[in-house]
């Protein structure tokens, strides 16, 4: 996880410690680098990255996705709605990141780093959103049953699920990064 200590969200703190905005930006880019490494292993190991059968696996998943109504795109941008969506989405991704933990051989540490860095990112964003409405967290029981269901899939579906999680998480973070730069 990139270094950084607490500092103010509003106004301009000194160079050390890192500002809230810089920590968030660096953290997202760090996670995106980790996802790239994991995607490399996934694509080398199977042909999932070229598969046209993604829809079969996507039916079993409810991965967070940015939509117009979330206010994170240039068209219809709404910073408060968007920030809530980013945090909510990251919280929803946590169960899928937990699923990824046993899915990698050579990149096991990288998968753990992505998971832990995401937790840190959520904390950074929650500080930035401290004046916004309460953010709903996913139900642990629902997450536990989803995890069990995903782990019970056959090998092909598990490989496809891994590929889809990484692709969706990358897209979600890229959209988040663009939006957060305005905030």
């Amino acid at each position: 996880v990139p270094p950084g200590e607490d500092s103010k969200d509003v106004a301009a703190p000194h160079r050390q410690p890192l500002t809230s905005s810089e920590r968030i930006d660096k953290q997202i880019r760090y996670i995106l680098d980790g996802i790239s490494a994991l995607r490399k292993e996934t694509c080398n190991k199977s042909n999932m990255c070229e598969s046209s059968k993604e829809a079969l696996a996507e039916n079993n998943l409810n991965l967070p996705k940015m939509a117009e109504k979330d206010g994170c795109f240039q068209s219809g941008f709404n910073e408060e709605t968007c920030l809530v969506k980013i945090i909510t989405g990251l919280l929803e991704f946590e169960v899928y990141l937990e699923y990824l933990q046993n899915r990698f051989e050579s990149s096991e540490e990288q998968a753990r780093a992505v998971q832990m860095s995401t937790k840190v990112l959520i904390q950074f964003l929650q500080k930035k959103a401290k004046n916004l409405d309460a953010i709903t967290t996913p139900d642990p029981t629902t997450n536990a049953s989803l995890l069990t269901k995903l782990q019970a899939q056959n090998q092909w579906l598990q490989d496809m699920t891994t590929h889809l999680i990484l692709r969706s998480f990358k897209e979600f973070l890229q959209s988040s990064l663009r939006a957060l730069r305005q905030m």
């Epitope: 160079r15 660096k26 930035k128 730069r181 305005q182 905030m183």
Partner: antibody, heavy 119, light 106 residues
Framework: EVQLVESGGGLVQPGGSLRLSCAAS????????MSWVRQAPGKGLEWVAK????????YYSDTVTGRFTFSLDTSKSTAYLQMNSLRAEDTAVYYC????????????WGQGTLVTVSS | DIQLTQSPSSLSASVGDRVTITCSAK?????MYWYQQKPGKAPKLLIY???NLASGVPSRFSGSGSGTDFTLTISSLQPEDFATYYC?????????FGQGTKVEIK
Amino acid sequence: EVQLVESGGGLVQPGGSLRLSCAASGFTFSPFAMSWVRQAPGKGLEWVAKISPGGSWTYYSDTVTGRFTFSLDTSKSTAYLQMNSLRAEDTAVYYCARQLWGYYALDIWGQGTLVTVSS
Amino acid sequence: DIQLTQSPSSLSASVGDRVTITCSAKISVSYMYWYQQKPGKAPKLLIYDMSNLASGVPSRFSGSGSGTDFTLTISSLQPEDFATYYCMQWSGYPYTFGQGTKVEIK
């Protein structure tokens, strides 16, 4: 044509106040963060402040914190810089600038308005 | 705040010359930008995020570098390129600028 037009500059005494305006046209104002950057006569550029598109977050340079306030009126596509307790060293051309969507670059700048603080 | 040092402070060059301006930071920066400013005018964005050419900027301008050392290159200087060039960085607030490099006609 995409443009920003600053106004409100002028001569003011030390300790006085001034409000600068930045009117945007030719683009949808609402998704963009805005910044003010100033340039003292014959000197380089100095970033002053930023405001997020909805005004929820503001950032200021140490030199103006507590004296300047950045605000928006999105219905008028206008940004404002309220400058209080002005000092001689605040004398500069003040530019407002739009932040490129999805990046930190300041891509569109106004022509600037001159603020002179002198007795 | 991150201090940026541009070199040279000024240079004289002829039309067609290849011109290189450098910008050094005391510590690593996240994003670097380059601007052109002509007398009495607002700065104009040339390069963003180290090496991306801004919309409408001629391809003779290019940016490179990472970490603490960055370069703006004008491959073949044109008459309209005589101006002052500034580097600017973002690594959290505040944004900071270099002191400028004035490109004059030899």
